[in-house]
């Protein structure tokens, strides 16, 4: 697989390829899940339509020491135009519900699959 921009990548792959690779990684996580993902860590739920990639990264970046989602975190950083650090959470997003990382990944995966089917790569 071509490495995604955001972690020592030589250049961005086409958006359709980038989205497909992110979907494949999320599928990987959900299929290989044996014990509770990231020890059942909780993250903020996000609006999956508004500025979704940065919002997803802001939520997941606060999970540390979970190797299962490290690649997803790196991939999402390539999808976000600004730098995101742990502890940052934009006022543009509502913080009202926390969900398990496993549920977050499933929700994100379902939404990305829908976007891919509809050809919304951007």
């Amino acid at each position: 697989l071509t490495c995604l921009g955001g972690f020592a990548s030589p250049g961005p792959v086409p958006p359709s390829t980038a989205l497909r690779e992110l979907i494949e990684e999320l599928v990987n996580i959900t299929q290989n899940q044996k014990a509770p993902l990231c020890n059942g860590s909780m993250v903020w739920s996000i609006n999956l339509t508004a500025g979704m990639y940065c919002a997803a990264l802001e939520s997941l970046i606060n999970v540390s020491g979970c190797s299962a989602i490290e690649k997803t975190q790196r991939m999402l950083s390539g999808f976000c135009p600004h730098k995101v650090s742990a502890g940052q959470f934009s006022s543009l997003h509502v913080r009202d519900t926390k969900i398990e990382v496993a549920q977050f990944v499933k929700d994100l995966l379902l939404h990305l699959k829908k976007l891919f089917r509809e050809g919304q790569f951007n």
């Epitope: 980038a18 989205l19 339509t49 390539g78 600004h82 730098k83 940052q88 951007n122």
Partner: antibody, heavy 118, light 109 residues
Framework: EVQLQQSGAEFVRPGALVKLSCKAS????????MYWVKQRPEQGLEWIGR????????IYDPKFQGKASITGDTSSNTAYLQLSSLTSEDTAVYYC???????????WGQGTTLTVSS | QAVVTQESALTTSPGETVTLTCRSS?????????ANWVQEKPDHLFTGLIG???NRAPGVPARFSGSLIGDKAALTITGAQTEDEAIYFC?????????FGGGTKLTVL
């Protein structure tokens, strides 16, 4: 006060290599993505690429792959753009810009004029 | 690669409201394009105005606002002033790279 101070104008021969610098003051470059943008006379802006100075991770526009190399030095708070195998097509003004949290490209350098001519 | 299109030139009068738009060649502009608006004044003076569709940069006058109108991103200047005469560039983020529009030359007469 936030400032991006770019290196001076360059006049170089075709085939040469040049390294432009962008020294930041008033903030830490490791806290932001730093971008480079090209502007040719009477043309629009072209995005070259970005760097995360904290870890050196970069992304380039495919058009500039193999042509541009972006690096950063957090100790001197400086971002660099190296351009190789220069041709007349590389004659342009090059800008560095800071990208803020949720945008925009809020602070820009004053630009470095690069002229490639024999 | 996508092409981003802007009006090449617009003219307005002081006090009037003017809207500049930014169209994507590959469909509707959404919040996931993180639309940016940048102002260029003479002598290569660039200033970032709006990020992420409608996020105004600190210090930018409130008369500048960003939005989505129909399938495009838009920059509205409510009550234009003579000092707003400039070239305005929009930029759209396509998953992992930026594409700039050609710029709109705004004249305030």
């Amino acid at each position: 006060e936030v400032q991006l101070q770019q290196s001076g104008a360059e006049f170089v021969r075709p085939g040469a290599l040049v390294k432009l610098s962008c020294k930041a003051s008033g903030f830490n470059i490791k806290d932001y993505y730093m971008y480079w943008v090209k502007q040719r006379p009477e043309q629009g802006l072209e995005w070259i690429g970005r760097i995360d100075p904290e870890n050196g991770n970069t992304i380039y526009d495919p058009k500039f792959q193999g042509k541009a190399s972006i690096t950063g030095d957090t100790s001197s708070n400086t971002a660099y753009l190296q351009l190789s195998s220069l041709t007349s097509e590389d004659t342009a003004v090059y800008y560095c810009a800071r990208y803020a949290y949720y945008g925009p490209f809020d602070y820009w350098g004053q630009g470095t004029t690069l002229t490639v001519s024999s | 690669q996508a092409v981003v299109t802007q009006e090449s030139a617009l003219t307005t009068s002081p006090g009037e409201t003017v809207t500049l738009t930014c169209r994507s060649s590959i469909g509707t502009v959404t919040t996931n394009n993180y639309a940016n608006w940048v102002q260029e004044k003479p002598d290569h003076l660039f200033t970032g105005l709006i990020g992420s569709t409608n996020n105004r940069a600190p210090g930018v006058p409130a008369r500048f606002s960003g939005s989505l109108i129909g399938d495009k991103a838009a920059l509205t200047i409510t009550g234009a002033q003579t000092e707003d005469e400039a070239i305005y560039f929009c930029a759209l983020w396509y998953s992992n790279h930026w594409v700039f529009g050609g710029g709109t030359k705004l004249t305030v007469l």
